[in-house]
Interface confidence: low
Amino acid sequence: SIPWNLERITPPRYRADEYQPPDGGSLVEVYLLDTSIQSDHREIEGRVMVTDFENVPEEDGTRFHRQASKCDSHGTHLAGVVSGRDAGVAKGASMRSLRVLNCQGKGTVSGTLIGLEFIRKSQLVQPVGPLVVLLPLAGGYSRVLNAACQRLARAGVVLVTAAGNFRDDACLYSPASAPEVITVGATNAQDQPVTLGTLGTNFGRCVDLFAPGEDIIGASSYCSTCFVSQSGTSQAAAHVAGIAAMMLSAEPELTLAELRQRLIHFSAKDVINEAWFPEDQRVLTPNLVAALPPSTHGAGWQLFCRTVWSAHSGPTRMATAVARCAPDEELLSCSSFSRSGKRRGERMEAQGGKLVCRAHNAFGGEGVYAIARCCLLPQANCSVHTAPPAEASMGTRVHCHQQGHVLTGCSSHWEVEDLGTHKPPVLRPRGQPNQCVGHREASIHASCCHAPGLECKVKEHGIPAPQEQVTVACEEGWTLTGCSALPGTSHVLGAYAVDNTCVVRSRDVSTTGSTSEGAVTAVAICCRSRHLAQASQELQ
Amino acid sequence: QEDEDGDYEELVLALRSEEDGLAEAPEHGTTATFHRCAKDPWRLPGTYVVVLKEETHLSQSERTARRLQAQAARRGYLTKILHVFHGLLPGFLVKMSGDLLELALKLPHVDYIEEDSSVFAQ
């Protein structure tokens, strides 16, 4: 039988005694920045080219003996996980190794930077097909390492990195915290986050997805036919590098944004036991375990969206938090969330020629998050329509008035503290779904987009208050682009999208001792693109 | 994921521009920043990545590195340029005393300086 980790990432249609998905990444080159490797191991012989790049610090300690098997252990295993003959994910991928970690598995930021520069220069000298760079290492937050990753990603390279094994917020580490990098946490055979001694996988909003990372069978550097089991977020990242190689081999023109969206889309959803994560990190951590797509073609018709959380704003009264989409993604909606419930909403605003999502803290609040819904929508023309606070008691409303523009998201922002505490609820008049509605003291922002074949509809789900959580999901074939709460209760902590479900969270009324009139209503905007569907059918 | 103004320790040395007897001083009021790893045991003081502003050419990087060496020598400090970056980021890697940071931050074209730090296999 195949190892558990390969079975886990394989969609059911490929599951057989043999793990043999089509096209094993043969058009893709994977660079590995790690320890030295045993290139004559039968798992990777002829598949990994050892470059002459080496930049490592001296080993610590006077009595350290350089045993080749120890020096090569980490890198050899990872090369095997990516492209090994028997236990590899992308059996057709070719690899190149750079030595940036010494025999103790230690390197430097500067050595890693020089390694990344080496890859960029190699790419310029001899352009090949798609490139994947695997960085199975982590250090403290580094502005310069993140900047270098950003530059390499913008040159068309896909970077995959380990989230880190510190049982901590991945945003505190680099390159895990670089937005352009695909950051991978580790799960085990039971879909539990991996525990490593007293520590374990990192988590949080800087993690893109998880992958198998415990008890992973791969090439051992003790002999050329030996196998060993290793664990860590490096092993998880190696799985994703392999999956990325497979996807890029099938569709070499995929951009980084498209690849990331596909990785997220084809992941197993909501299988991780979140209780392992600290409570305040659960909502920020993606509940996704990487998997290969069920078919190498035909994903193009899908409207892909993902949720991007900002950093925490901090508690100051004027504090704001900003969530940004990747350069070739569209911001289709913007929401906010505060654990204390003290927030002043959110708005979409232009920054450097691109829309960003900004959330506003309120006085006495512990801080807010901005949540951006970032989508792949080719040839989109999106704009934000704003209605200032209304004078009338009817509430504020705004709709998409331009011909051919559809509503993809609603945001509201207010200046008064604790909006809604003394205000009557405002309900949307029926039969007018293509508009955003809010309190009379709030500014309302509608995201309006025009794109070929784009159609959207509004779905609502209201439950009488008090209610801690209300959800509404989009049906099969539709993608959630907007998620917000209808005004009508002062207890709403915020709204955010989890996969294709809109979640509206309210205060735990049992602890606040207060009750609320009306209902807590989650409003989802669900969209699809007939144009993308037609285009993909023509390809078939 | 994390923005560039994210959760990491930042020591900002706000320095008034001084020509130090040389041309090409930075514009008045601009400041370069110094960054180091928030995790103390992982710091590697004595080696610094000097990152220059985005459009800086390789020749300007080399000239800035030489200028740092010359100014340091005038103050009796030895420095070693370990690598000049180009292709991804403009800048250079220098081995020098931390005493020279203030001087280095005043050099023309400097965007920020980061102290080297350790990374680990995961």
Epitope: H312, G314, P315, T316, R317, M318, F363, G367, E415, V416, E417, D418, T421 | -
Partner: antibody
Framework: QVQLVQSGAEVKKPGASVKVSCKAS????????MHWVRQAPGQGLEWMGY????????KYHQNFKDRVTMTADKSISTAYMELSRLTSDDTAVYYC??????????????WGQGTTVTVSS | DIVMSQSPSSLSASVGDRVTITCKSS????????????LAWYQQKPGKSPKLLIY???TRESGVPDRFSGSGSGTDFTLTISSLQPEDFATYYC????????FGQGTKLEIK
Amino acid sequence: QVQLVQSGAEVKKPGASVKVSCKASGYTFNDYWMHWVRQAPGQGLEWMGYINPSSGFTKYHQNFKDRVTMTADKSISTAYMELSRLTSDDTAVYYCARQYDYDEDWYFDVWGQGTTVTVSS
Amino acid sequence: DIVMSQSPSSLSASVGDRVTITCKSSQSLLNSRTRKNFLAWYQQKPGKSPKLLIYWASTRESGVPDRFSGSGSGTDFTLTISSLQPEDFATYYCKQSFNLFTFGQGTKLEIK
């Protein structure tokens, strides 16, 4: 200069209500929260609550929640604190104090001169 | 509620003495993001309103003499008067603003 001038001393019977005013001058009234703090004879300081004059938002200490009302009249830059159902335990000097509504400036930099409220039958 | 405990509740000292008053909170007042301790010290003389001396545990309010200094972090804080002056005899209060606002019970500083 910046000043908070409070209304004069009051003598009230148990069960009655008292309304103390605090007139601000020398600064922009809307930019600062107004807190109320009381001090019983020979005792320490006890925080009662605050009002944000710009929005009218209030937050009261648990002990006073049911019987205190804080209001503000922006047009005359005056904050008010009304305490109902008075008992002899409410005999105290009542202070208003301002706090800048920005960042972490969560301290009281200017205080009123105090208003003595005596509750006696 | 956060409880603030000051000690001593009273002390006698002479002009020129160095005096230390301590304040303990029942939970940390350090905001991990801003690295600021939300603690202030106030001075109150008989029949007068309190006066702000120190905020953020160690920042002196403008106009406050530099003989007054604040220190500490987390749950333990100290107000130090390096050389007592006649006008310093008063009652001193610490106050937390980490979660709403609570004052310590006060320390009365008297002339020996």
